[in-house]
Every structure is written in structure tokens, then in C-alpha cells.
Amino acid sequence: SAPFSFLSNVKYNFMRIIKYEFILNDALNQSIIRANDQYLTAAALHNLDEAVKFDMGAYKSSKDDAKITVILRISKTQLYVTAQDEDQPVLLKEMPEIPKTITGSETNLLFFWETHGTKNYFTSVAHPNLFIATKQDYWVCLAGGPPSITDFQILENQA
């Protein structure tokens, strides 16, 4: 069945980039890295230069939204993290520019960003019960919780 968000007419308008060049580390202190052109994975790194650097763009919804809605882009590229289905890897989608407006099926580009202490969660707007997650010996994917790891630390100002 279609996710709830696809059935709604909520429109998300781009505000601005709110973070540049940050690294995401999961609860096992594994950093997100590029697996290949399409997928991401997580690995314990000695050298954080190998970690993927992300930019975060903020969107405002057409309804009075209690959530912070964001898009994740690999820094200095035109590749955007895109949700698929549960337990499916997130894809890197190439787009010529950051979308000014997102609605309908394109909400798979958007995530609700939630912080609690040092923990950061990214819930898919298209699949609101699923999070960006790391999984042992697998790509970065969408998952509902354990055994996948859904909480991340944001490391900023990595020179």
C-alpha cells in the first residue's frame, strides 16, 4: 500500500542549507562511507577523510509542521540520499540542483531530522516508521529498528 505521505497533498519548500560537510557515525562508531556509485555502507575508520561528508538542506511544509524536514546531499556532488522500502538500501540519486519544491512520490528524498542528546535520527517522510540505518554486512538502508542501528552522531567541522 502507498505510504501515508504519498496520499497527502503536503508540499515541502526548500529553505536553505543548514549544515555543510558533516560526517555521520552510528552507535558502533562506524562512519558512513561510499560502497559504490549507488549505495552507502558503514565502516570503522582510522582516517575520517574516507568518510562521506554530507550537507543538510531544510524544507518547510505547507502545513504547520512540528518536525524539521531535511534533504541529505553528499558534499560537493549532486547526489542525494533517497529512501526505498523497508530493508532496502538507500540510493544515491543524481539531480542537477536541489529541488525547490517536493511533493507526492518525491518525498522519498526527505527525512524528518530528530535529535535527542547526541543521538540523531532520520525518519523517511515517505515511510514515517522507517529510519536511515546501518546493518552489519549490509548497505545503509531503511529499517524500523534493531538489529539495525538507527541513531547517529553528527561530526562537524572535520578538517
Epitope: S5, M15, I18, K19, E114
Partner: antibody
Framework: QVQLVQSGAEVKKPGSSVKVSCKAS????????ILWVRQAPGQGLQWLGG????????DHAQDFQDRLTITVDESMTTAYMELSSLRPEDTAIYYC???????????WGQGTLVTVSS | DIVMTQSPDFLAVSLGERATINCKSS????????????LAWYQQKAGQPPKLLIY???TRESGVPDRFSGSGSATDFTLTISSLQAEDVAVYYC?????????FGQGTRLEIK
Amino acid sequence: QVQLVQSGAEVKKPGSSVKVSCKASGGRFTNYAILWVRQAPGQGLQWLGGIIPIFDETDHAQDFQDRLTITVDESMTTAYMELSSLRPEDTAIYYCATGSNSYYGLYWGQGTLVTVSS
Amino acid sequence: DIVMTQSPDFLAVSLGERATINCKSSQSVLYSSDNKNYLAWYQQKAGQPPKLLIYWASTRESGVPDRFSGSGSATDFTLTISSLQAEDVAVYYCQQYYSLPITFGQGTRLEIK
């Protein structure tokens, strides 16, 4: 873990202003919302307003719209709450809280007692 | 504004017994986009700032004893202390963060019977 340390107690005259600071040690406010909450003697908790620094967005309770100013310094380590045109009924303990980008308080300051009296 | 109403205002419970505090919101705090309830519970002891116990209506904060639990959805919520300890004497507040202005319940004072 972030710890919030607030400025000391203040005694103010009616009609004056007070500025309370809230310093984060062990972290910054970058990813968080900041709430300001007050508690009059023997009373419950009342939300005054808040700020989400990453958006530079400030929210105020209607009752304080015209006399409340909430700011954060450039280093994102100190938040300020200024309340003007003070009246005796503003006598309260003022708290800052943060720790989430939703408006609930995971970390709380120790509180700042503001007494308004002529 | 969303009005938060707690009951009872005062509660006296014997040590080791169950304590139940209710919180009712004047409109739903269940957010349809992510199916979460935007409700928190705090404990405030005399002379101290509030302490977060529960957020998202039922998620227990790290370090909070598991005798504390939160339940409910939409407009009706409950904080339960399964076996009251002496150190649980405090005032308890619910808070909605679904919409502005943020609002708190009036508080429930919990004492030992």
C-alpha cells in the same frame, strides 16, 4: 553531555529589564531547540518562548510577545533571555532547557531567581 | 492553545504500590506524518529544575528507572510508577510540544501515604 549554567539571581525594579544567560558546557546549541520556562513561587511551569538557532527562528508565548527577546551568541554556546517592562508578577525562577530539536527539555539549567520589587 | 489537564492534583500512595497520573490534552498531540505523540513527562523535586522522564509519550529517558512508564495516545496519557519508592516524592508535569505555544499540565504532587 551538555550542562547548562545560568547567570545568578537578580533583583529588579518594576518597569526595568532583566537579561538571563544560559551557557552550555560540554557542547553547543547547534542541533537543538532552546526553551525558556518560568516558575512563579509555589506555581507550575510556564513556557515563555524558545529559539531554534540553526534556523534563527524565535517563538514566543502570546503573553510575552512584546517584551521578550531570545538570542544565542555566534559560538552557539550561550543563550540569552531578556524580559522588559518587568512587573511584580514576573517574580519567578527562570529556566533554560535544551537537548532536542523538538521543544522538550532534556538538559535544564539550575534556574535563575528574578525578583521584581520596588 | 492546547490545554493540558492533569489528574489528580494530589496523590498519596503507599511505598511499593502503583501510582498513576493522568494527563488529558484539549486536542490531539498525535502527529499524523510520523504517528508520534508529542508529549513529555517531567519530575520536579523541591528546589530543583524539572527532570525529563518520558518523551514521545512512552520513550523512557536514559537513566530513568524502569518503574516509570508512559502510555496513551492522541489526547489521553498516563504516567505510571509501578512500585513507589521514597525518592519518587515530587511534582510531576506533562507537556505537549505538538504545537505552539508549548503548554504544561498544572502538575500532580505525589507523596507517600
